[in-house]
Amino acid sequence: SIPWNLERITPPRYRADEYQPPDGGSLVEVYLLDTSIQSDHREIEGRVMVTDFENVPEEDGTRFHRQASKCDSHGTHLAGVVSGRDAGVAKGASMRSLRVLNCQGKGTVSGTLIGLEFIRKSQLVQPVGPLVVLLPLAGGYSRVLNAACQRLARAGVVLVTAAGNFRDDACLYSPASAPEVITVGATNAQDQPVTLGTLGTNFGRCVDLFAPGEDIIGASSDCSTCFVSQSGTSQAAAHVAGIAAMMLSAEPELTLAELRQRLIHFSAKDVINEAWFPEDQRVLTPNLVAALPPSTHGAGWQLFCRTVWSAHSGPTRMATAVARCAPDEELLSCSSFSRSGKRRGERMEAQGGKLVCRAHNAFGGEGVYAIARCCLLPQANCSVHTAPPAEASMGTRVHCHQQGHVLTGCSSHWEVEDLGTHKPPVLRPRGQPNQCVGHREASIHASCCHAPGLECKVKEHGIPAPQEQVTVACEEGWTLTGCSALPGTSHVLGAYAVDNTCVVRSRDVSTTGSTSEGAVTAVAICCRSRHLAQASQELQGSTSGSGLNDIFEAQKIEWHEHHHHHH
Amino acid sequence: QEDEDGDYEELVLALRSEEDGLAEAPEHGTTATFHRCAKDPWRLPGTYVVVLKEETHLSQSERTARRLQAQAARRGYLTKILHVFHGLLPGFLVKMSGDLLELALKLPHVDYIEEDSSVFAQ
């Protein structure tokens, strides 16, 4: 059978007897910044070009005695995971290696920066197809390393990095904390977070997704036909770099934002046991395990959205938290969440010519998170319509009045310290879906968008008795763009999107009592794009042989057939 | 020995090219900041990445590096420019005493300075 990790990332319909396209990733070049590598290993021979770049710290001034095979161990294994003949993810990808880690696997921020600069200069001198840069390393939070990653990403390069093996918040490490980088945590064969002793995979809002990272069999630098098992978030990141190479080879024009959204979309959802993560990190950590798409055809019509959490605001009364979307994503809605329930809502506001989501802490609150729903919506024209707090007891309401604009999200923000002491609003009359309704003490913000073929609908799920969690999901073919709660009273901790489900969290029922005040409604706004679907159908009609699907169908490879002769 | 000669040579060049005196003060109202790794054992004091403002050209980066060397030399400090960045970020990598940070933060075009630190295979 194929190794567990390759089986795990293979789409279900191919698991029975097929594995990988023989030339998957062939249009893509993957740069590996790591230790030296054994480039004549059978797994990677002819696939990896060792550049002349080397910038590593000395091993503390004494000669390093571990033989070359250990110096090459980490990098060789990762090169094999990305593109190895037998045990690689993207068997057709070509790689270039830069040595930025010494024989102990140690490097410097400055050496990594110079390596990234080297890649940028190489790209300028000789532009090739899509580039993926794999950074299977981590250091403490570094503003400069994150900035360099941002610049390289904005130059069209896809950067994939290890979340880190410190069983800690990935946001405390770099390049894991750089928003433009795809940050990967590690899971094992049971889809559980990888543990080793007191350490293990990092987690938190800076992780984009998880991938196999425990007991991964790959090229060993012991000898040119040796294999060995290694574990870590580096191995997980190598899987995602391989998947990215496959996707980019099938669709070379994909932008970083499109690639990230696809990686998230095709991941296995909700399979990780969240109990492993610290309680305060569970809601922030994506429950996603990377997988290859079953086909790239049919993906284009989808309206892709992801949830972006802000950093924690901190506890001061006027503290705010800001969540931002990537440059080519649209902010379609904004919500907020506070563990203490003390918050003053959220609003969408313009910052540097782009909409951001800002959440407001309240007096006595422990702090808030802003949660942005970031979507890929080509040719979109979005604006925010605001209604100030209403005088009438009916509550505040605002709708999308411009022709052709549809409602994609509702936010509410209030100045009063505790909405719970004020009468809640009457719920929205039926038949008026294109408007946001909120507490009369709150200002309401509607996100209104015009995009070709965009249609949206509101879906509500109300529970009369108090409950800690109320959810409502969009059905197949529709994508969740907005998630909010009605009413905005103080026992509601906030609302956030998890994949295609809107989650509204309330304070523990034992503290709220079971009065009508406890009633909570989760409001989801579900959208789809007929334009994208149409464009995709046209593309399918006129294209053949370029999708992953076609490559998969083209040649079936059983892993062990190619592997057994090494034994 | 080679290294010392290299340092001396660089220093002489920097002093010679320093025609415009001590300081072009940084742009009004902006203060450059200093950053270092929060994890103490991973810090590498003595090596610093000086990051310049976004639109700084390579020639300005080189001039700023030379200016730092000249000003440091006047105070009796040796510095070594290890790398001048361009292409991704404008700036330079410098080996110098931490005593010079205050001086370096006041140089023109400086956005922030970060002390070098370790990264590790994961």
Epitope: T35, D60, H65, H74, Q104, S220 | F120
Partner: antibody, heavy 121, light 107 residues
Framework: QVQLVQSGAEVKKPGASVKVSCKAS????????IHWVRQAPGQGLEWMGY????????KFNQKFKDRVTMTRDTSISTAYMELSRLRSDDTAVYYC??????????????WGQGTTVTVSS | DIVMTQSPSSLSASVGDRVTITCKAS??????VAWYQQKPGKSPKLLIY???NRYTGVPSRFSGSGSGTDFTLTISSLQPEDFATYFC?????????FGGGTKVEIK
């Protein structure tokens, strides 16, 4: 669960050879190097060498280089260590151990129960 | 070969005591050091890897520290099941070498 089970005790005469086996279970045998370590009575631990079961690659302590052979049979997930030209000071408990690689760390996480080899005339 | 000098070779202590065992490498081994516990007639058991990382399932009273040439294993509060022999091992350079061992006995 992951375990290494070694063959039983051996009594050998000086000049003879001994072959100790180490059967792995609970994990992919070819994915981890198997190291051999010995311990003379009342003494410390001494590393002898290792084999990478995915190939026939071996690395030995120079001290044993001319007398030790390490092999494996992947069909039965078993590694073997043969020591020839035995001397009385080869009397020891011989252990096999699995080496694990995590990040850039190496360590022996699983050990066999040990095989006592007595060399006596 | 790198020599790992472990001290003391034996020590007597009581339940609840704090015990410290040291290992000195003849040259820099960075953090490539592991510590093992061995009970009579049993095989060694991994406690600490990479100088300071506690292995899965090892009680928190065991901790390791050091880098370069000087390493320490500390048992913060000795328990009855901790009476055993402890070995350090360097994995920085072949051949891997072990310390001579420290026997922790009941006082």
């Amino acid at each position: 669960q992951v375990q290494l089970v070694q063959s039983g005790a051996e009594v050998k005469k000086p000049g003879a050879s001994v072959k100790v086996s180490c059967k792995a279970s609970g994990y992919t045998f070819t994915g981890y190097t198997i190291h051999w370590v010995r311990q003379a009575p009342g003494q410390g631990l001494e590393w002898m060498g290792y084999i990478n079961p995915s190939s026939t690659y071996t690395k030995f302590n120079q001290k044993f280089k001319d007398r030790v052979t390490m092999t494996r049979d992947t069909s039965i997930s078993t590694a073997y260590m043969e020591l020839s030209r035995l001397r009385s000071d080869d009397t020891a408990v011989y252990y096999c151990a699995r080496e694990r690689i995590y990040s850039n760390y190496w360590f022996f996480d699983v050990w066999g129960q040990g095989t006592t080899v007595t060399v006596s005339s | 070969d790198i020599v790992m000098t472990q001290s003391p070779s034996s020590l007597s202590a009581s339940v609840g005591d704090r015990v410290t065992i040291t290992c000195k490498a003849s040259q820099n081994v960075y953090t490539a050091v592991a510590w093992y516990q061995q009970k009579p007639g049993k095989s060694p058991k991994l406690l600490i890897y990479s100088a300071s990382n506690r292995y899965t399932g090892v009680p928190s009273r065991f901790s390791g520290s050091g880098s370069g040439t000087d390493f320490t294993l500390t048992i913060s509060s000795l328990q009855p099941e901790d009476f055993a022999t402890y070995f350090c091992q360097q994995l920085s350079s072949y051949p891997d070498t072990f310390g001579g061992g420290t026997k922790v006995e009941i006082k």
